[in-house]
Interface confidence: low
Amino acid sequence: FERTRSLQDPCSNCPAGTFCDNNRNQICSPCPPNSFSSAGGQRTCDICRQCKGVFRTRKECSSTSNAECDCTPGFHCLGAGCSMCEQDCKQGQELTKKGCKDCCFGTFNDQKRGICRPWTNCSLDGKSVLVNGTKERDVVCGPSPADLSPGASSVTPPAPAREPGHSPQ
């Protein structure tokens, strides 16, 4: 039968920032440069993340914690822990294989990321367009025409700032 170990694993005494070195009688050795261990009892240290290319260092690696990256200007983070960088576009644009392209008429994007989305169809909710949409902004839906019958409190739509679907370049 297999005898259970009554002695505590000596590696469990090794704190974060060290590893249990089997080559040195399980002595707790400091993590080598560019590596870390974030918990105690580790038998190896993990290699630090390198922020390279479009990534830049937000937090340096230490013996107990990994480096953290963000994205160089003109790009933004995606994914857990900024695992990805995506190119920024202007509002009113979306990213395609051939770079940033203006939103097609009838669509908008109010952010520097993501894709152009269709304007809201106010009539589906029985409402009217209060403010026309642009490449950067969705339409604003107002009360339905029936709500604007004589005697009801009227709403004067503000003049659109620019022609629908056109953005200043």
Epitope: V54, G79, S83, M84, E86, E94, L95, T96, K97
Partner: nanobody, 124 residues
Framework: EVQLLESGGGLVQPGGSLRLSCAAS????????MSWVRQAPGKGLEWVSS????????YYADSVKGRFTISRDNSKNTLYLQMNSLRAEDTAVYYC?????????????????WGQGTTVTVSS
């Protein structure tokens, strides 16, 4: 861990050629579109070329069209960029990039993994 490792950069005279390679690991290479992006000294990142997952569709920036050819060997998990008729303005660090799948169709993409880059210097 997803990794991209570029090689093949170097010093070349104007009019010369270079072939860049990008060895991919840690993901199913044949499932993803790939790109080459470059950064000239003191300038921003510039998209150079993309290739779809199968290798059937390729895309090029106007500045390299007719001179550069992107290709891939899915059996070797490797992306290539054949650069001919090189010019001084092609001097840059060239990055291999894996494209993610955040868009709604093939016309949208993002880059989610970058290599460390390989330097191409075109000078006489």
């Amino acid at each position: 861990e997803v990794q991209l490792l570029e090689s093949g950069g170097g010093l070349v005279q104007p009019g010369g050629s270079l072939r860049l390679s990008c060895a991919a690991s840690g993901f199913t290479f044949s499932n993803y579109a790939m790109s080459w992006v470059r950064q000239a000294p003191g300038k921003g990142l510039e998209w150079v070329s993309s290739i779809d997952a199968s290798g059937g569709d390729t895309y090029y920036a106007d500045s390299v069209k007719g001179r550069f050819t992107i290709s891939r060997d899915n059996s070797k998990n490797t992306l290539y960029l054949q650069m001919n008729s090189l010019r001084a303005e092609d001097t840059a660090v060239y990055y291999c990039a894996k494209e993610g799948s955040h868009g709604t169709d093939d016309s949208h993409y993002d880059v989610d993994v970058w290599g460390q880059g390989t330097t191409v210097t075109v000078s006489s």
